[in-house]
């Protein structure tokens, strides 16, 4: 599709005569008829196969024709065509005298013709004008002509359609030959594919507009080369998506088990020494003068009951002092002036003479102790509760209150991490010293078998055009997730180009 353009420049008819030689009255009011047709070796009358056009009256006798002539005419004259330009043509230009205002052929006498020229030849599409001058005995016509393509048509014969666009279907302008020239940041046959941010990871990243880098699930960062840890992860990182690799001092599937409680929480008070003893477990070793699980209680010197034989203890600045009952003496009232005759044994204890009656010894019933059976047995003094359990006296017995994660009479057993069936997708749970471990069935991985893994359907890289490959777990076949602009089971076809 294109336009043959004819620019009339000057017509000379000095004598103001018609082709017959007869003069025009009062002068030759001149207009032109133009006929464009296919190439003929000898130009003959007949249909104007490429088009025709007429001008209004442009002047009288001799005159120059201005560009875009007034009076409704157009200069250059336009002869549009909607076919491939063949490269050859025939052109007939007739100058006519208009006695009146009606310029239709049927309204003019045949002898109103002033002159007629006919040319033929080759003409290539281009912007340059070809200048020509045709002279007869009485007239001269100077003109130029060219063929140019219509808007959006390109190529040597105006046969290539190309319309610049910047939308969802493409981002390009047209080169002179009709080929597409992608706008900056776009690539592909139809310039539909954006060029991602430089360095954007080929597999983990994609983009929907130029210089962008969007990450596929599980990846983050400017170039999509950093993984995202598992959703439930608390104190961990990853080297591949959805992992949870524990930071130092943390354990468990989601790194939520505190293996370094001492450092993270500093539970021991009053300068006590803290020792980690398993998940969320610790032991405080108190400085002298302090007690309690966290050494939070200040000991009175008298709290250790140093006075024996019923002596009463009094705290002093520099220690303590024992007030001994009658019959006893010494720093701790440990020496007796009594004998069995004084019934010194309390709580049903039986008295035995010693040193020929100079002293005695008490044999105590169960649950009592002391030289005079005056003290109730404290079954917690031997610290029988393991793993930081708290010992409680309960009458003649004792019991341990265990910390979370431990059980048993003495808190000696670790509660099974497998009890709550943490392994997903039919994984088998194993209790280990360091926590639990899941043995996953085929097709699953991760600390809890929570990650679907490809069997091997994607091993052959079946997907084209940077598509993401997934394994369909129900059929062990691959599924290609196509990037924008591609379709097909392997993403092998650009959108708009069906398989040939």
């Amino acid at each position: 599709s294109g336009v043959f353009q004819l620019q009339l420049q000057e017509f000379v008819n000095e004598r103001g005569v018609l082709a017959s030689g007869r003069p025009c009255e009062p002068g030759c009011r001149t207009f032109f008829r133009v006929c464009l047709k296919h190439f003929q070796a000898v130009v003959s009358p007949g249909p104007c196969t490429f088009g025709s056009v007429s001008t209004p009256v442009l002047g009288t006798n001799s005159f120059a024709v201005r560009d875009d002539s007034s009076g409704g005419g157009r200069n250059p004259l336009q002869l549009p065509f909607n076919f491939t330009w063949p490269g050859t043509f025939s052109l007939i230009i007739e100058a006519w005298h208009a006695p009146g205002d009606d310029l239709r052929p049927e309204a003019l006498p045949p002898d109103a013709l002033i002159s007629k020229i006919a040319i033929q030849g080759s003409l290539a599409v281009g912007q340059n004008w070809l200048l020509d001058e045709q002279t007869s005995t009485l007239t001269r016509l100077r003109y130029s002509y060219r063929v140019i393509c219509s808007d959006n048509y390109y190529g040597d014969n105006c046969s290539r359609l190309c319309k610049k666009r910047n939308d969802h279907f493409g981002h390009y302008v047209c080169q002179p030959d009709g080929n597409l020239s992608c706008l900056p940041g776009w690539t592909g046959e139809y310039c539909q594919q954006p060029i991602c941010l430089s360095g954007c990871h080929e597999q983990n990243g994609y983009c929907s507009k130029p210089a962008e880098c969007l990450c596929r699930p599980g990846w983050q960062g400017r170039l999509c080369n950093e993984c995202i840890p598992h959703n439930g992860c608390r104190h961990g990182t990853c080297s591949t998506p959805w992992q949870c690799t524990c930071d130092e001092g943390w354990g468990g599937l989601f790194c939520d088990q505190d293996l370094n409680y001492c450092t993270h929480h500093s539970p021991c008070k009053n300068g006590a020494t803290c020792s980690n003893s398993g998940q969320r477990s610790y032991t405080c070793t108190c400085r002298p003068g302090y007690t309690g699980v966290d050494c939070e209680l200040e000991l009175s010197e008298c709290d250790s009951n140093p006075c024996r034989n019923g002596g009463s203890c009094k705290d002093q600045e520099d220690g303590y002092h024992c007030l001994c009952p009658p019959g006893y003496y010494g720093l701790h009232c440990e020496h007796s002036t009594l004998s069995c005759a004084d019934s010194p044994c309390f709580n049903g204890g039986s008295c035995r003479e010693r040193n020929q009656g100079a002293s005695y010894a008490c044999e105590c019933p169960p649950n009592f102790t002391g030289s005079n059976c005056e003290k109730k047995v404290d079954r917690c003094t031997s610290n029988p509760c393991a793993n930081g359990g708290q010992c409680l006296n309960r009458g003649p017995s004792r019991m341990c209150r265990c910390r979370p994660g431990f059980t048993g009479t003495y808190c000696e057993r670790h509660v099974s991490d497998c009890a709550r069936n943490p392994c997903a997708h039919g994984g088998t749970c194993h209790d280990l010293e360091s926590g639990l471990m899941c043995t996953c069935p085929a097709g699953f991985s991760g600390r809890r078998c929570e990650v679907r893994t490809s069997i091997d359907a994607c091993a052959s890289s079946p997907c084209f055009n940077r598509a993401t490959c997934y394994t369909d777990l129900s059929t062990d076949t691959f599924v290609c997730n196509c990037p924008y602009g591609f379709v097909g089971s392997r993403c092998e076809f650009p959108v708009g180009l069906p398989p040939s």
């Epitope: 699930p217 983050q220 400017r222």
Partner: antibody, heavy 118, light 107 residues
Framework: EVQLVESGGGLVQPGGSLRLSCAAS????????MAWVRQAPGKGLEWVAT????????YYRDSVKGRFTISRDNAKNSLYLQMNSLRAEDTAVYYC???????????WGQGTLVTVSS | DIQMTQSPSSLSASVGDRVTITCRAS??????LAWYQQKPGKSPKLLIF???SLADGVPSRFSGSGSGTDFTLTISSLQPEDFATYFC?????????FGQGTKLEIK
């Protein structure tokens, strides 16, 4: 226990500014990407912005680009949303959430209400 | 942006009922879909991610299924605490988008 606590919401006039804060605890904040998600009164959820943990890369929904800025201070375990040139349509409860634009939002704060009205 | 359409927008059910909520994506999102539960005046809570994986601490009566564009959340036996609004969310394509919500009410 993971905790996210938002603050800084309130009533502001159109064209005004607000800065929302989110204090995080119970997890290693610097290891995880974070996001803001909003919910207009009686409406659905709408992702607003995201910041990566690795290099602080930020992403925004089109309607807030150039007006909102998401940032984080790993030393203070805090996430922020600076909101400028506020419009009536920004009125919503704003939630701080742990997650990226391409991952689920695993933990959410209790939300803070932002009302833009003259 | 990918459109997420939930149906129904509301439904009434009784304790012990089996309930199904569906979510449809306007284009393929593979398995990258999450479900959230939100109670009035509270923040959303993650129930399910990657279409069918249960989040930590979520009861096993909740389950998810589907792939591509059609997804389902099922509650096998409704409990009183399950009456809430449920949202689906895709995180396969940027930007992430949510469904409009399904309100589950007591019959």
């Amino acid at each position: 226990e993971v905790q996210l606590v938002e603050s800084g919401g309130g009533l502001v006039q159109p064209g005004g500014s607000l800065r929302l804060s989110c204090a995080a605890s119970g997890f290693t904040f610097s290891n995880f990407p974070m996001a803001w998600v909003r919910q207009a009164p009686g409406k659905g959820l709408e992702w607003v912005a995201t910041i990566s943990s690795s290099d602080g890369t930020t992403y925004y929904r089109d309607s807030v680009k150039g007006r909102f800025t998401i940032s984080r201070d790993n030393a203070k375990n805090s996430l922020y949303l600076q909101m400028n040139s506020l419009r009536a349509e920004d009125t919503a409860v704003y939630y701080c959430a742990r997650g990226y634009y391409n991952s689920p939002f695993a933990y959410w704060g209790q939300g803070t209400l932002v009302t833009v009205s003259s | 942006d990918i459109q997420m359409t939930q149906s129904p927008s509301s439904l009434s059910a009784s304790v012990g009922d089996r309930v199904t909520i569906t979510c449809r994506a306007s284009q393929d999102i593979y398995y990258n879909l999450a479900w959230y539960q939100q109670k009035p005046g509270k923040s959303p809570k993650l129930l399910i991610f990657d279409t069918s994986s249960l989040a930590d601490g979520v009861p096993s009566r909740f389950s998810g299924s589907g792939s591509g564009t059609d997804f389902t959340l099922t509650i096998s036996s409704l409990q009183p605490e399950d009456f809430a609004t449920y949202f689906c969310q895709q995180y396969d394509w940027y930007p992430p988008t949510f469904g409009q919500g399904t309100k589950l009410e007591i019959k």
